[in-house]
């Protein structure tokens, strides 16, 4: 028998520095977690103690904090090189800055192979990108070899900016021939490493012949055997065992997100490459694990540029940006409109001639808007200003919901109107009329939504049975501010870009902004 230790991360999303327990900015260092300096300490400890160790990343290193905004992926290559990752799969967010934003900072600079078997380049890009990522990699580990085959969510064209010259194929269809090729090379221990979410990970384990282990990402799935060490609730045991169609027991793992945990899986193989046993658990990277001093020093050196960036002008406003709770928790506010417009703009993807865009709607809890921005400071808007408006380090995500769920959400928005509560929704691509004289749960008298399958966008009444795409904060997708119906009834959820980054990019693009209050939210009673 031969034993392999798989260390794995996924959906790190730019958390290079240690974070608080909820993966936001670290405030009290003695209670902070994660970060690459702490991760390195643990990885090195395991490498020294165990003979056959692989360190793998299942994608979405890109996007999530000011580190990515400023360094655009160079920080990912630098620190992953320093940690000596063995391989990485491409995630959807690796395409957020287009193909060039992947090639130059990461693909050309990574000392470790970057993988995806189901992304195929065509046209002029094919020769440019050829060999810069691989479908699979054979890694020598001790006296053996291990094959790693990569995959990426085929939804990436809707979630990021891969352009028109990359084709995202069905994962299972693309993986099988690559696994077969590895078999012909006499590689009999094969790990599928990828970024398509836990449901697809399980399907790959079930359907792709020859895959021994699946290491996944995208769905931020937390798996754990025994009593979990922090706040995350396990979606199942670690590893999650799938019985393949050909009768094998295939371990599937994921390690939550944001570098909070290091996945730790021990696999025992027989001489023919069959998995005999698998066990492990994610390791919580809490403050009991010291930060490596040399990596920490390097982080501090790279940090300097971030502090300078925070005070630079992104663009100008010529109007007061009303982000006060007195406005945004009671009525349409122009800060809410600005943020929603930025959210839609960030999700413009012309992937189908029938649709002007794949999504037209935005909802945003008023309680998530934490500060106004005064235009009487020469109109200047900085990252620092935006961080005061959106201080929680969230993301703006894409969900699919039925019209009936949206109707419930808007009823919830005003079910206890007048108490300055955070659930009052700001909107984009939606016209809503409330009648507060009616009883809670029956106050939405008109709800019109902007069409997507149209050449001239116009507002049509919401259809209860239709499925709509909506951009909203991850806080709402997770049922925050009492929006349990969204969490319970959503049909799909893909995590998006950092909230501040979305708004800052929009302001930089527009240069000068002047959002208005324009009748997106109306009240049909005379008192409003």
């Amino acid at each position: 028998a031969w034993e392999l230790t798989i260390l794995h991360t996924n959906d790190v999303h730019s958390r290079l520095e240690q974070t608080s327990e909820d993966s936001s900015k670290c405030v009290n260092a003695s209670r902070c977690m994660g970060g690459v300096a702490r991760l390195f300490t643990k990885v090195q400890q395991i490498r020294r103690a165990e003979p056959n160790v692989l360190l793998l990343d299942a994608g979405d290193q890109y996007q999530g904090t000011i580190w990515f905004t400023v360094y655009k992926g160079a920080e990912v290559a630098h620190f992953m090189n320093a940690l000596r990752y063995d391989a990485m799969a491409l995630g959807n967010h690796e395409f957020d800055n287009g193909v060039e934003g992947l090639i130059e900072p990461l693909l050309k600079e990574a000392k470790f192979p970057i993988l995806s078997a189901n992304i195929k380049a065509k046209g002029p890009l094919a020769s440019q990108i050829s060999g810069l990522y691989l479908p699979y990699k054979v890694l020598p580990v001790g006296d053996e070899v291990v094959g790693i085959v990569g995959y990426t969510s085929k939804e990436t064209p809707f979630l990021s900016n891969p352009g028109t010259n990359l084709v995202f194929e069905d994962e299972i269809t693309a993986l099988q021939p690559e696994v077969d090729k590895l078999k012909t090379l006499n590689v009999n221990k094969i790990i599928a490493l990828g970024h398509s979410g836990f449901e697809m990970d399980k399907l790959i384990a079930q359907k792709v012949r020859g895959v021994d282990v699946v290491v996944g990402g995208h769905s931020n799935t937390f798996l754990y055997t025994g009593n979990p060490p922090s706040k995350e609730v396990p979606a199942g045991k670690y590893p999650f065992i799938v019985t393949s169609d050909d009768g094998r027991k295939v371990p599937v793992v994921q390690a939550y997100a944001f570098g909070k945990y290091l996945g730790y899986l021990k696999i025992e193989f027989d001489e023919r490459g069959n998995v005999i046993s698998s066990h492990g658990n994610p390791i919580l990277l809490n403050s009991s694990i010291p930060e490596d001093p040399s990596i920490k020093a390097d982080i501090n050196k790279w940090r300097i540029k971030l502090d300078n960036y925070s005070t630079q002008e992104l663009g100008k406003t010529i109007v007061y940006l009303d982000g006060s709770s007195q406005s945004c928790r009671f009525r349409e506010c122009n800060m809410g409109n600005l943020i929603c417009d930025a959210m839609i703009n960030n999700n413009l993807r012309h992937t189908d001639e029938m649709f002007w865009n794949h999504v037209s709607m935005c909802i945003l809890n008023g309680g998530g808007i934490r500060s106004p921005i005064d235009e009487r400071n020469n109109g200047t808007i900085t990252w620092e200003n935006l961080a005061a408006v959106l201080p929680f380090g969230g993301t703006f995500d894409l969900v699919q919901l039925k019209g009936s769920t949206l109707k419930k959400a808007f009823e919830h928005s005003v079910h206890r109107y007048g108490q300055s509560t955070g659930e009052f929704l700001q909107v984009g691509g939606i016209h809503v009329v409330y009648d507060l004289s009616r009883k809670p749960g029956d106050r939405v008298v008109k709800l019109d939504v902007l069409c997507t399958k149209c050449r001239v966008p116009s507002y049509d009444p919401l259809k209860m049975d239709e499925v709509y795409k909506v951009i909203l904060p991850n806080f709402l997708a997770n049922g925050g501010d009492g929006f349990q119906m969204i969490k319970d009834e959503l049909l799909r959820h893909d995590s998006g870009d950092q909230d501040i980054n979305v708004v800052s990019t929009y302001i930089s693009k527009m240069k000068v902004i002047y959002p208005a209050v324009e009748g997106r939210i109306k009240f049909s009673t005379g008192s409003h």
């Epitope: 063995d86 000392k111 192979p113 810069l132 691989l134 054979v138 890694l139 020598p140 070899v145 090379l185």
Partner: nanobody, 126 residues
């Protein structure tokens, strides 16, 4: 595009020497471990020599030990195979190969190498 281009092959008499070169482009050269393989007519492709990213680690096939040396010039993005005391059984097409990754000891295994050149013919006449 990642490309490997071999040169320096030719016809040489038994006991003679040749120096093969392989120029790499399209990827940071120091991120690649480099190897040489050869294939004689009707035979399997076989490992000859390999060198780690830094140049500190080398590996050789038993059949060429003491006769062949491998080196790299990271400034020129080139790896060299110096072949001395050549024998007729060294006749083959010689392929340059590159392994994306950083390992202290380069691999002898064909499957580990990700990029391949088109080969250069070496003929040792008796």
């Amino acid at each position: 595009e990642v490309q490997l281009v071999e040169s320096g092959g030719g016809v040489v008499q038994t006991g003679g020497s040749l120096r093969l070169s392989c120029a790499a482009s399209g990827r940071t050269f120091t991120h690649l471990a480099m190897g040489w393989f050869r294939q004689a007519p009707g035979k399997e492709r076989e490992f000859v020599a390999a060198i780690s990213n830094s140049g500190a680690g080398t590996q050789f096939a038993d059949s060429v030990k003491g006769r062949f040396t491998i080196s790299r010039d990271n400034a020129k993005n080139t790896v060299y195979l110096q072949m001395n005391s050549l024998k007729p059984e060294d006749t083959a097409v010689y392929y340059c190969a590159a392994d994306w990754g950083t390992r202290d000891s380069p691999s002898k295994l064909n499957a580990v190498y990700d990029y391949w050149g088109r080969g250069t013919q070496v003929t040792v006449s008796s």
